[in-house]
């Protein structure tokens, strides 16, 4: 797809003897305007054959009213350049007419008074993408100046308008059988699509490269009219290509609107209406297939079922975003509870609790003390940011609510034997050893190195552990 | 100076069919970008288009009676020919025709000389 | 179908009196048309491709608008003014008429 411009410099009476009348006068004040017609190939120009490539209509120019006497200027222009979208290939060659209309401005019954003042036509081989052309035609006595250029509209490139490329979006490939875009080596072409030439009213096509017909078209291109030799007998007046009076196909029978695209005619033509994520004369280009790797973050993508999507990409967790493309905020919904650090480490969630607290997301709260009872007597003891809990002798655990073995520990040092007792453990000390937990060497002269022992226990008496 | 004027049948019957010319001048049909049209305007009520016809034979109706009309032209005698079938007393009403200009592909630009109409009655 | 919808459907107004018509369509069209009918005529083109004057329509005619809401305005009434007015659009098969807006002389 691309868009024909054309620049008209300027319109009046050419070179040599003979110069035209104004077309203008003070009794009759008019404007002008230009129309172009476009014609792949190089066809012939007969006005009465269609516009395939397209047409287009200037503004109205200026009011002009002649001076009397004077000759016939330069005639004042419109503003702003013509321009002819063309939505299949820019053909290289192509023939045009430049038609100078009048509008006559005076106080006539009925409408607008058109009459044509100069028709130009020619054949000309361009580029698409190229610089401006300039051409000079003559028409009778009148010359017309202009410049003339074709122009690829995104996602379209090449001299054909052919080569469709998409950012890409991989930053090392493009897709599958895909080459990057010269000179915009950061886009990936994109597959083609309808035959080229394949006729915009006539034809459409599903694959890419096919030409499929409208009931009542036949042909490669889909230009050659079915013959209308099975209508019965034709009545009243009839041109060279109506035989009959069976109305013909119209352009939205057999609807040439592809996914889902509504048709409805226009007054020469038709018009679809693509749902989201198509585009095209026929919504036939999706904006962005599977094939452009559009998944962001390592999403899969798949081929959307729902008509509206031509894709879908199924995100890994951490992203979302009908792309992928947003990283998702996880901390933003402060699953760390208790005034805990949220950190998103992308693979997993982690949460940094503050003093007191624990679990996954800070939700155990460890130093309160406030209605949390220690089993079995035991008492809870609040400090150094952790709750616990003083266990009666017997007890252990968090809660004390386990059965303690006291001599599991092996708690008696020095080969010291150890029972466990009702009221907790008793050490009986190797010879040599003495304390509670066979703790202090006896001395050789037979004092020992703490202060005598409690009144009732000899040295080497088993030493109960209060 | 462009004229364009209706005639046919002012009285039909239902069931019938009406065929209507509209024989213009000061233009022709052979010119790039001119078209026919025809619209009616049943008595007291809006107007309705019901068809037209471009200088290259593109032709529209519209959808509601596209299986009862039919657009035609002789472009050597400049003359458009609508014909509808199986008329219905509802298809009172005057018949006009128009001239249509389009300059540019799909744009029509004005609607801008009309024929003076033909009062057609469907009655048994 | 694209409907358009004229209003009002009726008014009254004075020679001199500015008058605006409006013309809105259910769905987006690119140009609008105006016509001017009196009883027993046929109906005359005044505005074509929205804004511009039909020829021979004076000057105290005029038409804007864009997208759905169009507008025809008549700056100074004057006698031969009083008639029935139709937008029309374009854009899509069927190229339907508004429903009409009869002024009349109050």
């Known amino acids: 797809a691309g868009v024909f411009e054309l620049q008209i410099h300027s319109f009046g009476p050419g070179p040599g003897p003979g110069a035209p009348r104004s077309p203008c006068s003070a009794r009759l004040p008019c404007r002008l305007f230009f129309r172009v017609c476009l014609k792949p190939g190089l066809s012939e120009e007969a006005a009465e054959s269609p516009c395939a490539l397209g047409a287009a209509l200037s503004a109205r120019g200026p009011v002009y009213t002649e001076q009397p006497g004077a000759p016939a200027p330069d005639l004042p222009l419109p503003d702003g350049l013509l321009q002819v979208p063309f939505r299949d290939a820019w053909p290289g060659t192509f023939s045009f007419i430049i038609e100078t209309w009048r509008e006559e401005l005076g106080d006539q019954i009925g409408g607008p008074a058109w009459s044509l003042l100069a028709r130009v036509a020619g054949r000309r081989r361009l580029a698409a993408g190229g610089p401006w052309a300039r051409d000079i035609q003559r028409a009778g006595a009148w010359e017309l100046r202009f410049s003339y250029r074709a122009r690829c509209e995104p996602p379209a490139v090449g001299t054909a308008c052919t080569r469709l490329c998409r950012p890409r979006s991989a930053p090392s490939r493009c897709g599958p059988g895909l080459r990057p875009c010269a000179p915009l080596e950061d886009e990936c072409e994109a597959p083609l699509v309808c035959r080229a030439g394949c006729s915009p009213e006539h034809g459409f096509c599903e694959q890419p490269g096919e030409c499929r017909c409208l009931e009542g078209w036949t042909g490669p291109l889909c230009t050659v009219p079915v013959s209308t030799s099975s209508c019965l007998s034709p009545r009243g007046p009839s041109s060279a290509t109506t035989g009959c009076l069976v109305p013909g196909p119209g352009p939205c029978d057999g609807n040439p609107c592809a996914n889902g695209g509504s048709c409805s005619e226009t007054p020469r033509s038709f018009e679809c209406t693509c749902p989201r994520g198509f585009y095209g004369l026929r919504c036939e280009v999706s904006g962005v297939t599977c094939a452009d790797g559009p998944c962001f973050n390592g999403g899969l993508c798949v081929g959307g079922a729902d008509p509206d999507s031509a894709y879908i990409c199924h995100c890994p967790p951490g992203f979302q975003g009908s792309n992928c493309e947003k990283r998702v905020d996880r901390c933003s919904l402060q699953p760390c509870r208790n005034g805990g650090l949220c950190l998103d480490l992308g693979h997993a969630l982690r949460c940094r609790c503050r003093a007191g607290f624990a679990g996954p997301r800070c939700e155990h709260d460890l130093d309160d003390c406030a209605g949390r009872a220690c089993a079995n007597g035991g008492t809870c003891v609040e400090g150094g940011g952790a709750h616990r809990c003083s266990c009666a002798l017997g007890f252990g655990g968090r809660d004390c609510r386990e059965r303690a073995d006291p001599c599991a520990a092996r708690p008696c040092a020095h080969g010291g034997r150890c029972y466990a007792h009702f009221s907790g453990l008793v050490c009986a000390c190797a010879p040599g050893y003495m304390g509670a937990r066979c703790e202090f060497p006896v001395h050789p002269d037979g004092a020992s190195a703490l202060p005598a022992a409690p009144p009732g226990l000899r040295p080497g008496d088993p030493q109960r552990y209060l | 100076q462009i004229t364009l004027k209706e005639s046919g049948p002012t009285l039909v019957k239902p069931t019938q069919t009406l065929t209507l010319t509209c024989t213009f001048s000061g233009f022709s049909l052979s010119t790039s970008g001119m078209g026919v049209g025809w619209i009616r305007q049943p008595p007291g009520k809006a107007l309705e288009w019901l068809a037209h016809i471009w200088w290259d034979d593109v032709k529209r109706y519209s959808p509601s009676l596209k299986s009862r009309l039919t657009i035609t032209k002789d472009t050597s005698k400049n003359q458009v020919v609508l014909t509808m079938t199986n008329m219905d007393p509802v298809d009172t009403a005057t018949y006009y025709c128009?001239?249509?200009?389009?300059?540019?592909?799909?744009?029509?630009?004005?609607?801008?000389?009309w024929g003076q109409g033909t009062l057609v009655t469907v009655s048994s | 179908d694209i409907q358009m919808t004229q209003s009002p459907s009726s008014l009254s107004a004075s020679v001199g009196d500015r008058v605006t018509i409006t013309c809105s369509a259910s769905s987006s069209v690119s140009h609008m048309y105006w016509y001017q009918q009196k009883p027993g005529k046929a109906p005359k083109l005044l505005i074509y491709l929205t804004s511009n004057l039909a020829s021979g329509v004076p000057s105290r005619f005029s038409g804007s608008g864009s997208g759905t809401d169009f507008t025809l305005t008549i700056s100074s009434l004057q006698p031969e003014d009083f008639a029935t007015y139709y937008c029309q659009q374009w854009r899509s098969n069927p190229f339907t008429f508004g429903q009409g807006t009869k002024l009349e002389i109050k």
């Open positions: 128009a001239r249509i200009v389009s300059f540019d592909n799909d744009v029509v630009s004005a609607m801008d000389y």
